[in-house]
């Protein structure tokens, strides 16, 4: 049988065959970080020969060669220094604007191993536009310097390099120019996960529920779909399966997107998936069509039975036939729900095409994309019913242009991208949607992503303190109140001097607010049993603060989602006419239901929540505590149906100072707070002033270690009382 | 779906102040995608632009008025104002409002008649 | 400033294919917009950025712009396209509308 021949190495480099030495085997060459290979592959042809892509001589030896970035081209009103040709990576220019022009975008920018600049384009402007100077990004020349209402600025790469992003721009009414920033790039280069995922998270989230369902004022900011409870999202993964696709990278592929699928259903926002496998020929695995595709179950298995040899017999890439199956399922969609319907005309489409390589057959997938704008009438009023992201994976055949051609283009978003392999593929979906990149007011909402921060990952946890040393933990329930425990409160001092520190993107301290007022519930007592031998008692142990200013959403400042109201029901995905006993049923369903809260150091700590039997059991170990309740007859007269319990097996306990913050438990990626600490039998910091130190209890310590939490399900009344104005509360 | 709707006197003295108002309804007139302006049209004539206010209440005006015009905002009721100094009979036209999103006149009011009587 | 040049009138014969063109220098490098005026009533925009057509629009309304010219296409004429048509383009943060067609279904 014919094959190639094996003397194919790259100096400095590696290489991989997807169908060993056979004809039609493609080999990829890869080199270290900061090169990059050329050729960057070869095809085994059934000559027994190797093929180079766009080469002139069959055979050139593979090399790995230095990764540079694009020089500035010019720069206007004012300098950049050095004046290279082009820049190693490691690499810095530096930019400085004339004499009344303001720097917006970054002084100095490196040059990075992927052969993208970091930071942002600098930009020398006076603000004399109606929009703003768009800049010139490096390795640009733009045409047109005027920047009012209707004018139009055009852009060319220089050299080899390539645009992404749009060519022309114009100057709209609201100051914004139309599409997306211009960058000219290597066509070698590609792109970091960590660019990427908050790049299509960003643009992605304003389709995930970005404005609050419930929010009482529907003003609009920026570019911010809004997905009301009637609204709908149509999204189509359509997944390359051709012959340079391996088998292994077809399966990150399917794992993927059943990420990607996964974190849309934990939204509040009623979702349709298609699923579209493609080589030569697409295959409809999952239609918007069928009910089954607003199942997670449903479509997460369609996609598990996605099978790599479904496209044995068809080999090549064929976009165009994978984009126009989305374009008939939309018009069979049309005619069956009516053109000119509210049912049809509010449904968003998002479309995400994976893809190793550029199409090679059935002709230009643009016509396709041209087909669906068509058909949704899509518009300036209604560029926000369709977003296409295109998305090339592996440095090889993936044709920029193209990519970028396919894309939307929306100012401040990016739709194409290049990936360098299916891991980086895999990272970008586990991070995209990590929306804690919302700006509103979406609540439970924390950054699951391995590399975020502690404050990032519980948005909600703030930290109350007097004057001097830091006191108690509460939680952000919406954007100027805090839910955190009355005991905080019990010297009664004035409220004036205390601080509430709420996290800030800008600060890895934070931000300190001043309460404007602190609801402490009148039930409240410490001493109100002392006759009875009960020493301290902690019934009703919950207090409200409202700040003195909103709280500015970001990353870092996000409410947590409570149980029974609106809010917290659309973020389960109940159904509409769900009651406050539902949400118990759903979040405490378990004799041991595992929770969370939230260390002195940030870091999220875990719980079980005892309920039913277990609760009893769990609460028993009250009466062997003989300091603070030495004549204790009745435990349930310390431990009421008003605390939840936890504390048994490997539970970690909270210390004094972690009192009031929430406890809470996750659901379908977003978090609920069932519960804030109260009391307990044991505080693991005693004697520590290191907030990372805690000491378990040791296994014979009589009482053995438990703690208390308020139960948010049983302070229905009081917190209705006061929360009436700010949730929207369910039914009981 | 944003309707506008101008108000204001039908008949103006030459050299006095001509003042419509325009209402919209269906949607805030602060929203940033949206821009706002005057266009007239003298009988049997084309359509001429008078000026633009934008959310950020910038303006621009059609040269031609030489400083006669003043467009304003006044969001508590939804509304935007045009107040056209020193007129003359050359001043009579059916004058629109219009709203845009993005670079074009997408939505009209259905014109009002202003006559300038000597 | 920036002048926009319309025929006065252009005619068509029913079903037939009517083009009205918009002058302008290096017009190609602005967008242009369309709006139809029917007798009595508000004008209505029917192609924006020289070849888009807003919802509502019927698929005979097409647009085109190249070097110094501006083409509003109206195929298969209707009695109801009878009325004036007019080009637009922003210059500056300034509008200008190009002076009218007049355009008669036969």
């Known amino acids: 049988a014919t094959s190639c021949p094996q003397n194919v190495n790259i100096s400095g480099g590696t290489f991989t065959l997807s169908h060993g030495w056979a004809p039609g085997s493609l080999l990829i060459y890869s080199c270290p970080q900061g090169l990059y290979p050329s050729p960057a592959s070869r095809l085994c042809k059934s000559s027994g020969q190797w093929q180079t892509p766009r080469a002139t001589r069959s055979l050139t030896k593979a090399v790995c060669k230095p990764v540079r970035c694009p020089a500035p081209v010019s720069f206007e009103n004012g300098i950049y220094t050095p004046r290279l040709g082009s820049y190693p990576v490691g690499g810095n220019v530096s930019f400085e604007c004339e004499d009344g022009f303001i720097l917006r975008g970054s002084p100095v920018r490196q040059c990075r191993p992927n052969g993208m600049w970091d930071g942002e384009t600098a930009v020398c402007d006076n603000g004399a536009g109606h929009c703003p100077n768009p800049g010139i990004s490096l390795g640009a020349v733009r045409t047109g310097s005027r920047f009012g209402h209707g004018d139009k600025v055009r852009y060319r790469c220089s050299s080899n390099l390539v645009l992404t992003g749009s060519a022309e721009r114009e100057c709209q009414g609201n100051g914004v120019w139309s599409g997306t920033e211009p960058i000219c790039r290597q066509p070698y280069s590609y792109d970091f996960p960590e660019d990427v995922a908050p790049a299509l998270g960003t643009s992605f989230s304003h389709m995930l529920g970005a404005t609050n369902p419930t929010q009482r004022t529907k003003e609009s900011l920026g570019r911010k779909i809004q997905i009301q409870r009637s609204g709908h999202l149509n999204l189509y993964l359509l997944l390359d399966s051709s012959q340079s696709v391996s088998e292994n990278d077809f399966l990150i592929f399917k794992e993927s997107a059943s990420l990607m699928v996964d974190r849309i259903f934990s939204f509040e926002i009623n979702v349709s998936v298609a699923i579209i496998t493609f080589a030569s020929e697409p295959k409809v695995l999952m239609s918007v069509l069928n009910v089954n595709s607003r199942d997670i179950t449903e479509v997460i298995s369609s996609l598990e039975n996605a099978k790599y040899k479904d496209h044995e017999n068809g080999t090549g890439t064929n976009t165009y036939a994978a984009l126009n199956s989305v374009y008939l399922m939309m018009n069979n969609q049309m005619q069956l729900l009516g053109m000119k319907t509210m049912a049809w005309q509010e449904i968003r489409h998002a479309i995400i095409l994976l893809t190793d390589g550029k199409s090679n057959m059935g002709g230009s997938p643009k016509t396709a994309v041209d087909q669906i704008r068509e058909i949704l009438n899509i518009n300036q009023k209604r560029n926000d019913y369709l977003d296409i992201y295109a998305i090339g994976v592996g440095k090889l055949d993936v044709d920029w242009r193209e990519l970028n051609e396919l894309g939307s283009k929306k100012d401040g978003e990016r739709h194409a991208f290049i990936l360098q392999d299916t891991k980086a593929l895999h990272q970008v979906f586990e991070h995209m949607l990590d929306v804690s990149k919302l700006t509103d007011t979406i609540c439970g909402v924390g950054n699951m992503s391995a590399n975020a921060s502690d404050q990032e990952r519980t948005p909600w946890h703030v930290t109350i303190k007097p004057k001097s040393q830091e006191t108690c933990r509460g939680a952000l329930i919406s954007d100027q109140w805090v839910l955190t425990a009355a005991h905080c409160f019990r010297d009664g001092n004035d409220h004036s001097l205390w601080r509430v520190n709420v996290g800030d993107p800008k600060s890895q301290w934070g931000k300190e607010f001043l309460i404007e007022k602190a609801v402490i519930s009148p039930g409240f007592d410490v001493f109100a049993k002392k006759n009875q031998g009960i020493l301290e008692f902690y019934g009703d142990d919950i207090a409200l603060l409202k700040l003195a200013q909103k709280v500015k959403m970001s990353t870092h400042a996000r409410p947590i989602c409570l149980p029974c109201t609106m809010e917290a029901n659309l973020a389960l995905r109940r159904p509409q006419g769900s009651t406050c006993r539902d949400h118990e049923n759903e979040l405490l369903n378990k004799q041991s239901v595992p929770a969370h809260f939230v260390a002195l150091n940030g870091s999220k700590l875990n719980i079980n929540l005892k309920m039913g039997v277990e609760w009893t059991s769990c609460a028993e170990v009250v009466s062997q505590e003989k300091t603070m309740f030495p004549n204790l007859t009745d435990v349930r007269e310390v431990v009421t149906d008003q605390f939840l319990c936890s504390g048994t097996q490997e539970d970690e306990s909270p210390c004094k100072g972690e009192s009031g913050g929430a406890v809470f438990l996750e659901r379908r990626f977003r978090f609920f707070q069932v519960g804030l600490v109260s009391w307990g039998l044991y505080n693991p910091c005693l004697g520590s002033a290191d907030k990372n130190s805690r000491k378990r209890a040791p296994r014979s310590k009589v009482p053995p270690p438990r703690d208390f939490h308020i139960n948010l399900f049983r302070m229905q009344p009081w917190l209705r009382q006061h929360l009436g104005d700010v949730l929207n509360f369910l039914p009981l | 779906q944003l309707q506008l709707q101008e108000s204001g006197p039908g008949l103006v003295k030459s050299s006095e102040t001509l003042s419509l108002t325009c209402t919209v309804s269906?949607?805030?007139?602060?929203?940033?995608?949206?821009?706002w302006g005057w266009i007239r049209q003298p009988p049997g004539k084309g359509l001429e632009w008078i000026g633009t206010i934008y959310y950020s209440g910038r303006t621009y005006y059609n040269p031609s008025l030489k400083s006669r015009g003043t467009i304003s905002v006044g969001t508590s009721k939804n509304q935007f104002s045009l107040k056209l100094s020193s007129v003359t009979a050359a001043d009579t036209a059916v004058f629109y409002c219009?709203?845009?999103?993005?670079?074009?006149?997408?939505?009209w009011g259905q014109g009002t008649l202003v006559t300038v009587s000597s | 400033s920036y002048d926009l040049s319309q025929p006065l009138s252009v005619s068509v014969a029913l079903g037939q294919t009517a083009r009205i063109t918009c002058g302008g220098n290096d017009i190609e490098s602005k967008n242009v917009h369309w709006y139809q005026q029917r007798p009595g009533q508000a004008p209505v925009l029917v192609i924006y950025r020289n070849s888009n057509r807003p919802s509502g629009i019927p698929e005979r309304f097409s647009g085109s712009n190249s070097g110094n010219t501006a083409t509003l296409t109206i195929s298969r004429g209707q009695g109801g396209d009878e009325a004036d048509y007019y080009c637009?383009?922003?210059?500056?943060?300034?509008?200008?509308f190009g002076g009218g067609t007049k355009l008669t279904v036969l």
């Open positions: 269906g949607g805030p007139i602060s929203s940033s995608s949206y821009y």
């Open positions: 637009q383009v922003w210059d500056s943060s300034t509008v200008i």
């Open positions: 219009a709203g845009g999103v993005g670079v074009t006149w997408d939505y």
